[in-house]
Amino acid sequence: KSSNEATNITPKHNMKAFLDELKAENIKKFLYNFTQIPHLAGTEQNFQLAKQIQSQWKEFGLDSVELAHYDVLLSYPNKTHPNYISIINEDGNEIFNTSLFEPPPPGYENVSDIVPPFSAFSPQGMPEGDLVYVNYARTEDFFKLERDMKINCSGKIVIARYGKVFRGNKVKNAQLAGAKGVILYSDPADYFAPGVKSYPDGWNLPGGGVQRGNILNLNGAGDPLTPGYPANEYAYRRGIAEAVGLPSIPVHPIGYYDAQKLLEKMGGSAPPDSSWRGSLKVPYNVGPGFTGNFSTQKVKMHIHSTNEVTRIYNVIGTLRGAVEPDRYVILGGHRDSWVFGGIDPQSGAAVVHEIVRSFGTLKKEGWRPRRTILFASWDAEEFGLLGSTEWAEENSRLLQERGVAYINADSSIEGNYTLRVDCTPLMYSLVHNLTKELKSPDEGFEGKSLYESWTKKSPSPEFSGMPRISKLGSGNDFEVFFQRLGIASGRARYTKNWETNKFSGYPLYHSVYETYELVEKFYDPMFKYHLTVAQVRGGMVFELANSIVLPFDCRDYAVVLRKYADKIYSISMKHPQEMKTYSVSFDSLFSAVKNFTEIASKFSERLQDFDKSNPIVLRMMNDQLMFLERAFIDPLGLPDRPFYRHVIYAPSSHNKYAGESFPGIYDALFDIESKVDPSKAWGEVKRQIYVAAFTVQAAAETLSEVA
């Protein structure tokens, strides 16, 4: 079959026609439309937006657009019994209370249904006790507290600053330390860039601004009550006591104005070093408890949120492939927001909307992609990636057989400095080639390619003349596709300058101030960065769906496998005596990586030479490429994390947002010197090396000549 049987336009012209149809003005218009009211998961407003998007995608020309609903566990504050934190005196009188809501931004004073700041899935409770400041509540922060400073958090309420790691990891660490409550706050050191004004006069976080967010430790499970299976009409639901990933202690977020009032009274130990000090005018004493005159005062939490099984709605649009309709390229991003979603997610949803419109325009002119493209507007991402995970659980058999690639489309911007890409190594060459064809939107790079500005501003730490591409972690909707199902995945957005802006994420993340005006006034007035992200995301989807040979280069996987093997070996070699004592060898892993490299090289040679007019051989070669990512899946999953099944990559056990390479070996080696049974611990290291070596070897063999 001709690869262009569905059209008389050349593939090159198709891509150009697709990209030329994308318009910044449309993205701007869509963003405005999506951000005028809150679209919290499980609410009527978000259901109405789902139906609007369904209707518009149909108008744009997709073959079908369906709503896929699930009944999942969500969490909401009690409307009549608000959450807050107080300082109480010795008589139990509340002498200070934290704010009940954020001061609304100008023009939004009369908007109803703004959910007040809360930590989703916090249990109810009213713990009171002494405060301990735990810095970012990372694993290493608790090591410092417990091991070096001999401070016991048991029975204490801990206060941690947001940033560096996923908030759910902070809560898990606090629970393991024995805390009875957690207060999360945004420190200006992390959420206030010097020299920039607070919203509404700039893009910084005001003192009353608060970051919402879920505090689950799902490890890829999806709906906490139906792990592994879709939360459909006939689902069997676990009891709340058996639910996956729920926190066991009350948690609440506050802004830095309220944090000041709590932290300024702290006594006890001084901070261990300057890395524990933020930018507030307080001592950053660790505690426990308040100083001198205030030592009889305690902190009390009042948390009354409820967990409720609630219906959510994904929108799934289909553009059927002309040649390989049973091969799916998926573009997905979420629709639900904490409040207005000016950046997260609607800057992404607006881009997806424009990509759908452009594809629809081409389809109306008689064109079809070679492969089927699925477009998804996911629900309840903010509550634990629930919409995408439930849909993938429901369709897992189709996806594992037919899924070519997944491109994520959450926030298009987190800054306006340069491009940021995280993806499977299979997509490195696709991203490089595409960005060489796109124009840079950056000032000072007029007439230059996106590749050039990206490489200049964000150079690869390993390869000169190339841009940095990061590992996939989690915290977004690609998780189930990549980490559980082994579908090649990628994401792209515009980001900040990490060298000069060391705050975590963007300052107004998950606050009421994440509005349309934030984007239009301060981040991207011309919507040129949004357009560039649309070109990158859309261009990747176009190539993946339309190229005759899948644009995957397996040799790039070989390169990173060697790098990751070297890295994990060097970590293990910090314990040379134990490696000798317990006969720990990485020979099998290095041998497997060597074999993978040789086989990948030979496969690439065959890929250049085979007869592309033979549809059977073409399909066979493409299947080997498509199934390579799948070959890295271990059906048994990682230890204690059955839904993280990718052997090469997993979200870090210490930070869900970050990706870790050879995670099974890494976790087995982590803090191994403190293990009570070293023989058992090093035995697990050996087992994990075995699993990794076997998996790499098995993946290599999928690229061998089939007969």
């Epitope: 001061p103 609304p104 004073e109 607070s198 000041q260 930018s279 307080v282």
Partner: antibody, heavy 121, light 106 residues
Framework: EVKLQESGPGLVKPSQSLSLTCSVT?????????WNWIRQFPGNKLEWMGS???????NYNPSLRNRISITRDTSKNQFFLKLNSVTTEDTATYYC??????????????WGQGTLVTVSS | DIVMTQSPASLSASVGETVTLTCGAS??????LNWYQRKQGKSPQLLIY???NLADGMSSRFSGSGSGRQYSLKISSLHPDDVATYYC????????FGGGTKLEIK
């Protein structure tokens, strides 16, 4: 432009209650910030008395806690000071002020023009 | 309460001179200190916040410094318009003001 204006009786008898109103224009007191009362004694010494936040929470100077109350009427965009059991020591110029914040450091950005209250029999 | 002590209580200087006002706290206030200027018959006006940050609309001739318990306000190239009483304010834990420094022109 944000404006604050104090009003209330200029003369109060000892042991009675002092009541003042601060009327705010140009900004809704429920939209943000903390709304404060500060007084200046005849010798020019300034004393912060207390505040009410945009969401109705109070914070008081511990030295006045037993006799101070700060309330508000959101429909009129006003907040009020009530000081019980006054003595001649409470004679002062009373200011209302809006508190701003930066990096968690509090400060008073907008002030009323002040109203003199004399406590005398 | 944290006690704020300003010195001198009053100061007379000539136009064009540089003057320094000091403010001491009875304990460490970690930079949580503001300076206000109050002209005769007017309400106080914010001058410096967070010990070192110049408030919007104020002349760059004013600068704040200090940490821990000791803070100072420097006024360079004195103008006749600078005649006022200057107050420091502690905003650590509770809010307390210094007694003020009255600045006059010789």
């Amino acid at each position: 432009e944000v404006k604050l204006q104090e009003s209330g009786p200029g003369l109060v008898k000892p042991s009675q209650s002092l009541s003042l109103t601060c009327s705010v224009t140009g900004y809704s007191i429920t939209s943000g910030y903390y709304w404060n009362w500060i007084r200046q004694f005849p010798g020019n010494k300034l004393e912060w008395m207390g505040s009410i936040s945009f969401d109705g929470n109070n914070n008081y100077n511990p030295s006045l806690r037993n006799r101070i109350s700060i309330t508000r009427d959101t429909s009129k965009n006003q907040f009020f000071l009530k000081l019980n059991s006054v003595t001649t020591e409470d004679t002062a110029t009373y200011y209302c002020a809006r508190e701003g914040d930066y990096y968690g450091s509090s400060f008073f950005t907008y002030w009323g023009q002040g109203t003199l209250v004399t406590v005398s029999s | 309460d944290i006690v704020m002590t300003q010195s001198p209580a009053s100061l007379s200087a000539s136009v064009g001179e540089t003057v320094t006002l000091t403010c001491g706290a009875s304990e460490n206030i970690y930079g949580a200190l503001n300076w206000y200027q109050r002209k005769q018959g007017k309400s106080p006006q914010l001058l410096i916040y967070g010990a070192t940050n110049l408030a919007d609309g104020m002349s760059s001739r004013f600068s704040g410094s200090g940490s821990g318990r000791q803070y100072s306000l420097k006024i360079s190239s004195l103008h006749p318009d600078d005649v006022a009483t200057y107050y420091c304010q502690n905003v650590f834990r509770t809010y307390t003001f210094g007694g003020g420094t009255k600045l006059e022109i010789k």
